[in-house]
Interface confidence: medium
């Protein structure tokens, strides 16, 4: 089955390459013959994934306000067979709050 | 904040070995990948390869395989890069670069960078 | 020689915009995100441009990257004498299975 906690990602990060966290099968055993696959909106562009252990990175800058979550896809391929290991699963990540919308008194 | 502080100077005589240090801080260190990066003198930049610094995975430019290991000690965030055989070509500077995974990351923190100077 | 091509000089005068391209193929520009780096002189590079087209926090406006199909490139605008540095531009070639650095270009800033 899939492995993972939930994502996080800080709104306004202040670096260009957030590592989120890890995404695997409990089958792979990391002798990298499994493919990691990320699909959905902000995949590829706004999220990527490292095809061989499964980290996914933010490489771009969130705003909570526009989108407090993302509702992504995984995959997770044999490579020698081309068939999938587990089921796409669907996984969410949140944009953690910065408060940068803080009450006025 | 990210930094990646390296070994210092080195010369050596053809034929030698030398191996570089980079020691990592301000981040988990397992997360990302460091890449390594030449540039000799007055000359551009050229990657070397890449090592995955939680299963030690690596992955080499053509030009180097052979020639160069890229290893890491997860316990003190460094990683090292031993380069053996030196000729007078492999004089220059060597930079460790954090990122490099396929496709899209990019080197986002460079090291300052190490002179290494082959001379007979 | 560069797998990505890169002029080797490019001068401007403080406030004109200046473009430098960089040149591929399929196998990298065509297929991958274009990074860019400056380096000052005496200094290790910095990233200027990641994935095309985004600026690390820090990095000016004046400074942006686009590509299109096989070529990228970067323009400055509003130049300034501390912009005077060499330039590459780096990309993973899907047949190397590597990193791939443009020759690097030499910015001067006149006057």
């Known amino acids: 089955g899939w492995v993972w906690n939930q994502f996080f990602v800080p709104e306004e990060m202040n670096t260009t390459s957030h590592h989120i966290g890890q995404l695997r099968s409990d089958l792979d055993n990391g002798n990298n013959s499994f493919q990691y696959k990320l699909l959905g909106a902000g995949a590829g562009s706004t999220f990527i994934i490292d095809e061989r252990t499964g980290d996914i990175y933010a490489i771009q800058k969130l705003d909570r306000e526009e989108r407090s979550l993302y509702i992504l896809r995984a995959q997770v391929i044999d490579i020698a067979t081309g068939r999938a290991v587990e089921p796409e699963s669907e996984f969410v990540i949140k944009v953690s709050d910065i408060n940068d919308n803080e009450p006025k008194f | 904040q990210v930094q990646l502080v390296q070994s210092g100077a080195e010369v050596k005589k053809p034929g030698a070995s030398v191996k570089v240090s980079c020691k990592a801080s301000?981040?988990?260190?397992?997360?990302?990948?460091m890449s390594w990066v030449r540039q000799a003198p007055g000359q551009g930049l050229e990657w070397m390869g890449i090592?995955?610094?939680?299963?030690?995975?690596?992955t080499y430019a053509q030009k180097f395989q052979g020639r160069v290991t890229m290893t890491r000690d997860t316990s003190t965030s460094t990683v090292y890069m031993e380069l053996s055989s030196l000729r007078s070509e492999d004089t220059a500077v060597y930079y460790c670069?954090?990122?490099?995974?396929?496709?899209?990351?990019?080197?986002?923190?460079w090291g300052q960078g190490t002179l290494v100077t082959v001379s007979s | 020689q560069s797998v990505l091509t890169q002029p080797p000089s490019a001068s401007g005068t403080p406030g004109q915009r200046v473009t430098i391209s960089c040149s591929g193929s399929?196998?990298?520009?065509?297929?991958?995100?274009v990074n860019w780096y400056q380096q000052l002189p005496g200094t290790a590079p910095k990233l200027l441009i990641y994935?095309?087209?985004q600026r690390p926090s820090g990095v000016p406006d004046r400074f942006s990257g686009s590509k299109s199909g096989t070529s990228a490139s970067l323009a400055i605008s509003g130049l300034q004498s501390e912009d005077e540095a060499d330039y590459y531009c780096?990309?993973?070639?899907?047949?190397?299975?590597?990193?791939?650095f443009g020759g690097g270009t030499k910015l001067t800033v006149l006057g």
């Open positions: 670069a954090r990122g490099g995974i396929k496709l899209w990351l990019h080197f986002d923190y």
């Open positions: 301000g981040y988990t260190f397992t997360s990302y990948y």
């Open positions: 090592i995955h610094p939680s299963g030690g995975d690596t």
């Open positions: 399929r196998s990298n520009i065509g297929s991958n995100f």
């Open positions: 994935t095309n087209n």
């Open positions: 780096a990309v993973w070639d899907d047949s190397l299975n590597g990193w791939v």
